[in-house]
Amino acid sequence: LPAQVAFTPYAPEPGGTCRLREYYDQTAQMCCSKCPPGQHAKVFCTKTSDTVCDSCEDSTYTQLWNWVPECLSCGSRCSSDQVETQACTREQNRICTCRPGWYCALSKQEGCRLCAQLRKCRPGFGVARPGTETSDVVCKPCAPGTFSNTTSSTDICRPHQICHVVAIPGNASMDAVCTSTSPTRSMAPGAVHLPQPVSTRSQHTQPTPAPSTAPGTSFLLPVGPSPPAEGSTGD
């Protein structure tokens, strides 16, 4: 004969364990039902009655089968330098990621605590290393024969145009000015074309949000703006 199916609550076999989606209640000394994601244990089980589950209250969640007395509080609303990539629901926490043009300057166990604006390279400097989700732009001076006339977090140094007759020679922050009508572009040394920077908005990581106060302010951490690196601007 097949073994009789036990209904919760039930006493486990000596040395045995409770089944999937059940937990052992120390007080009742019984195997009892866990609550599904989106719910929590409103009343714990006894020897004669199973766990009573209830829906998570507004702005709280449980992601796993559980027997917690209260659901977990969702993180604060995303600050102005972040985008909400996952809403707070009964079954999942809010996820905030840095918006395009920003990167995560201070990460936490999961996700980002503080977003910072990507550095912009000033004229005469180009992007040596593009910004990523978790790292800032690195600027470098434009090598001879190349220039950048923009303040940008994405523009690299570009080669000067080659003139048949030069009206004004180019420098690190200005292209050459020709008198002829058909200039050509040199492939000057150092005119490396970098790939476009990756978006700072994650589509695959699942950080938990940092609680935020007013938009754009950090929570608990007195982190001021870092001094701009050489060739960068604080804009």
Partner: antibody, heavy 120, light 108 residues
Amino acid sequence: QVQLVQSGSELKKPGASVKVSCKASGFNNKDIYMHWVRQAPGQGLEWMGRIDPATGNTKHDPKFQDKAVLSSDTSVSTAYLQISSLKAEDTAVYYCARSPYGDFGAMDYWGQGTLVTVSS
Amino acid sequence: DIQMTQSPSSLSASVGDRVTITCTASSSVSSNYLHWYQQKPGKAPKLLIYSTSNLPSGVPSRFSGSGSGTDFTLTISSLQAEDAATYYCHQYHRSPWTFGQGTKVEIK
């Protein structure tokens, strides 16, 4: 755009009942709560209760537990507040307001209000 | 129940003045669950500040909020004529959710 449109003013006699409706448009009724707040003439705001339209679960201020019945019909995106055993002191403007799940109860859109007058 | 007490109950100030309204809770309220509403005569309330210090889109930056625990503040940095209204704080920390009694702001 998001809109909450309430039914018109009501004049009722003491002891009667009234049912106020609040029709929602411009958003998904899922993952929101619909609250009812009352305001007696010249007085402040008083939270009465709320309903989760997706599940029908309700929560009341105990003061209104036996007075107000909250319901909703998702097929017509409408929430209802029924007040029974009306008394003169129930004369008030009744507002519906929504709060999205996860916004910590911030009521971001309100109906225009329904004036209920109880007089013999 | 958590009682919310606002002060002052009413005030009169001139255009350009800095106005501060305080809201004191009878027990601690998480800052995420404290909101402010503005209500003009004959109109429905409007969400002015959510989660203690955050402004919904369209709310002028002269409005700001701060506080924690039991003491919260709404500030209007430079009062404008259109700010004449009654302001309510609201806690959603513990049911039943409650409002302050309101602060009426008049323009001198």
